[in-house]
Structures are given as structure tokens and as C-alpha cells.
């Protein structure tokens, strides 16, 4: 969209699961009809076509002329439309990568979950509610990012190395908080500043490794808008 | 071209009843949603009633609701507004639109209007 | 119901001037606004959707922008053929709502 005009950003991570987001306000009057229900949702590509199977039919409607100072836009697609009596179409190959949950949508949830989020998935989403009595919308744009855990220096490491891991997201903003923990066995065991460990925003510095430290570590990136993003790295320290 | 024709207004007294036709050509009539719009003289646009393409939903404002009928005749590329029990504030210019989308609900094809005077 | 509500209610202008019609939606509408044009005795026609894309035909003269509350429509440089009332329309929800027109006469 042209500056100045923007709608909700939701992020997601390649590759694994986004959910963008979609419960109007219903009055309770209307609770009991959600069975009747009717969503589509619609897709806008942020850039170059939208990955489908040459020749598959799009959507009826205009084509309208994109803001100035912008080159074409992809086509509008129809992801995903659920009739009123349950009945679905949509557009292959997302198909069955794209799921709306039919208990969240007899609640008013119209989300759309999409199993894994890939990159071709981002840009603008317009999702259209009918209702009996009601028409309503949300818009939304996806963006996607890639999570990373880098080491430096890289590859396997010798007792009483130094290491530092690097928790990264390709996101502009800054995380509000990052937090590192350990796989041990069952469950994650925060990982702690100390003499051992020092912590300083998206980075971890082991100064001095032992084979102890060999295997997984983990960082979780949650940022202000509440989208986390949980990365690991597997460190191998030779004896 | 796309094109929209409205006819069927005329003088009517209040409490009686009137159809308005909308004839569609240029485009898949079939694959659009459609809409009535109206605007008293001199005054702004009021939106009235709406059909999906597959007629599986229909909405009217509440100024019409239980008084008009909006239907979609695919077969004859043709929009109707049954309208009864008139009232003088429903005087005003008739138009046949187009919705852009079945899923985005703005008008991008318009007839000339009909008018239509409710008076006794 | 969401109201629109439009200001000015009319402007006068001349050619070449640049011209700014705004409209205020009583809750968040996201970027779902159009704006029409329409002339005496004529059908409305469709010029911006989704607050800020043009549609066929129109000439880049004519721009929109906002998103939540508050959208504008601007001419950056008055035509003759511009003169004429601007409505401004939420496509977000039912029933679709319009604001109560810009009249835009010649100074």
C-alpha cells in the first residue's frame, strides 16, 4: 500500500505455522447463527505472482489500477471460501497448507491458519464474513521472517574455547525480550548470567566451553506485538 | 462495455408498491454481487440492499427492512427491487451497482438511476 | 452503524489548485474507504478503494490515503472536469455507509 495507508502487520516465521488473526466484534444476537456462517479469504501478494499451478482460474472481479508510483500487483486470489452450509473451495497448492478451525468459527474465530507459512504467503489478506444478517471483514498484511542461530567461530569447538551465539529474526524491530534456555532431557532449563554465561540482548558468550555444553541451546524472541519465535542451535564441544 | 440499466420507477402513492429492473451486460453477471443504492434529491447516497453472486446472502439497511426484496434473476443477466408499503421518504434516485468483489464491498459499476416519487 | 463524516461539506478552488477532502469513520475501518465522484444529474463513478489504490481510468491527479479513522482524498492539481460533489464510503462492514458528501465548486 502507499504510505499512509496501512492495515495490521501479523509476522510469522518461514516455515512454521501462522495464524492471521480474524474475530470480529458479533453482536449476541448473532452468536447462534455462526452454523450459517460464510468466510472467504483472500490473498494479495506482497511481490512477483502468487504460487499456484499455471492456468488456475482467479477469482471474478475487476482489475483495478495499483497506486501510483507502484508497478503491477499480483492478482487477488481467493485462498480459501467456506459456505454457509460448511461446504469449502479454494485455491491449490495452498491447499491443505490453509485451515480455518470449524469449532473457532461456530465461536466467531474466522482465523486462518496456515500450516507451515511459507515466503510466497506475505502480503495483504482481506478475509470477508457473511453472516445472516451481516457482512463483516478484517485485513491484515503478512509478513514473513526467517529465524537464525549463528556461532562465532563456527563448527565444532575444543574444551576451553569461547563461543558466541547470535539469536536472530529478520524482523526491523528490536525483540522486547530474549530469553535462552537448555534441552535437558524433558524440559528447557533457563540459562542465567554468570561467570559461565554472560547475556547481552540477542547474543550469549560462553567464554570458556566444556563438553558439558555440547547439545541444544535455545533463545526465544518475543517481541511487543506478542509474536515469539523459539530458534535452536546444537553446539558440539570435542573432549 | 459493462453496462447497467435501471427502469421501473415512476409516481407512486404512499403505501403502494413498485419493481425496479436493472439489466446487466458487458461483464459475467452471474459472478458479481449486486446492489441497490439510492439518493433522495438534493441529498447524499444511502446504500438499501445487497446479493451475493450465488444470492447465498442478502442484507438490507434497516430503513427498508420487511418493506424491500432484492433478487437476482442469473439467467437473465437481471437485479429486481421489489419495493411495498412506500413511504415519501423513499423518494429518491434508484441505482443498480455493481460490487467490486463478493468479499469487498465497494461499487464499481453504476447504472443512470431510475427515480421514483412516492407521493399522493 | 458506522457513521462517515466528511469535511469540508463544500470547498471552493480553482484550476491548478490542490485540493484535500477528508473523511472520519466513527470506529476503525482499517483501509476499507472509497471515494466517488459524481456530477449533477449523473451516477456516481468509483475513483479510490481500500483507501489508497486508484481504480482503472482514474487519473494519477487523484490519490488517497489514511487507514483506522481517518482518510483523505487529494487532487494535486484541479482539472475543470474536477468540480463536482466527493463522497467518501467504509466497504469494512454492513450496512456499507457513505459520508454526507464534499460539494467542490469553482472559486
Known amino acids: 500500500l502507499q504510505p499512509g495507508a496501512e492495515v495490521p502487520v501479523v509476522w510469522a516465521q518461514e516455515g512454521a505455522p501462522a495464524q492471521l488473526p480474524c474475530s470480529p466484534t458479533i453482536p449476541l444476537q448473532d452468536l447462534s447463527l455462526l452454523r450459517r456462517a460464510g468466510v472467504t479469504w483472500q490473498h494479495q501478494p506482497d511481490s512477483g505472482p502468487p504460487a499456484a499451478a499455471p492456468g488456475h482460474p482467479l477469482a471474478p472481479g475487476p482489475h483495478p489500477a495499483a497506486p501510483s508510483s507502484w508497478g503491477p500487483r499480483p492478482r487477488r486470489y481467493t485462498v480459501l471460501s467456506v459456505g454457509p452450509g460448511g461446504l469449502r473451495s479454494g485455491r491449490l497448492p495452498l491447499q491443505p497448507r490453509v485451515q480455518l478451525d470449524e469449532r473457532g468459527r461456530q465461536r466467531g474465530d474466522f482465523s486462518l491458519w496456515l500450516r507451515p507459512a511459507r515466503r510466497a504467503d506475505a502480503g495483504e489478506y482481506r478475509a470477508a464474513v457473511h453472516l445472516r444478517d451481516r457482512a463483516l471483514s478484517c485485513r491484515l498484511r503478512l509478513r514473513l521472517g526467517q529465524a537464525s542461530m549463528t556461532a562465532s567461530p563456527p563448527g565444532s569447538l575444543r574444551a576451553s574455547d569461547w563461543v558466541i551465539l547470535n539469536c536472530s529474526f529478520s524482523r526491523p524491530d528490536r525483540p522486547a525480550s530474549v530469553h535462552w534456555f537448555r534441552n535437558r532431557g524433558q524440559g528447557r532449563v533457563p540459562v542465567r548470567e554468570s561467570p559461565h554465561h554472560h547475556l547481552a540482548e540477542s547474543f550469549l558468550f560462553l567464554p570458556q566451553v566444556s563438553p558439558m555444553d555440547s547439545g541444544p541451546w535455545g533463545c526465544i524472541l518475543t517481541y511487543r506485538d506478542g509474536f515469539n519465535v523459539s530458534i535452536m542451535y546444537n553446539l558440539t564441544v570435542l573432549g | 462495455q459493462v453496462q447497467l440499466v435501471e427502469s421501473g420507477g415512476g409516481l407512486v402513492k404512499p403505501g403502494g408498491s413498485l419493481r425496479l429492473s436493472c439489466a446487466a451486460s458487458?461483464?459475467?453477471?452471474?459472478?458479481?454481487?449486486m446492489s441497490w443504492i439510492r439518493q433522495a434529491p438534493g441529498k447524499g447516497l444511502e446504500w438499501v440492499s445487497y446479493?451475493?453472486?450465488?444470492?447465498?446472502?442478502?442484507y438490507y439497511a434497516d430503513t427498508v427492512k420487511g418493506r424491500f426484496t432484492i433478487s437476482r434473476d442469473d439467467a437473465k443477466n437481471s437485479l429486481y427491487l421489489q419495493m411495498n408499503s412506500l413511504r415519501a421518504e423513499d423518494t429518491a434516485v434508484y441505482y443498480c451497482?455493481?460490487?467490486?468483489?463478493?468479499?469487498?464491498?465497494?461499487?464499481?459499476?453504476w447504472g443512470q438511476g431510475t427515480l421514483v416519487t412516492v407521493s399522493s | 452503524d458506522i457513521q462517515m463524516t466528511q469535511s469540508p461539506s463544500s470547498v471552493s478552488a480553482s484550476v491548478g489548485d490542490r485540493v484535500t477532502i477528508t473523511c472520519k469513520a466513527s470506529?476503525?475501518?482499517?483501509?476499507?474507504v472509497a471515494w466517488y465522484q459524481q456530477k449533477p444529474g449523473k451516477a456516481p463513478k468509483l475513483l479510490i478503494y481500500?483507501?489508497?489504490y486508484r481504480y482503472t481510468g482514474v487519473p494519477s491527479r487523484f490519490s488517497g490515503s489514511g487507514s483506522g479513522t481517518d482518510f483523505t482524498l487529494t487532487i494535486s492539481s484541479l482539472q475543470p472536469e474536477d468540480f463536482a460533489t466527493y463522497y467518501c464510503?467504509?466497504?469494512?462492514?454492513?450496512?456499507?455507509?457513505f459520508g454526507q458528501g464534499t460539494k467542490l465548486e469553482i472559486k
Open positions: 446479493v451475493t453472486s450465488g444470492g447465498d446472502y442478502i
Open positions: 481500500s483507501a489508497s
Open positions: 458487458g461483464f459475467t453477471f452471474s459472478s458479481y454481487a
Open positions: 470506529q476503525d475501518v482499517t483501509t476499507a
Open positions: 464510503q467504509q466497504h469494512d462492514q454492513s450496512p456499507w455507509t
Open positions: 451497482t455493481r460490487v467490486a468483489y463478493d468479499y469487498e464491498w465497494y461499487f464499481d459499476v
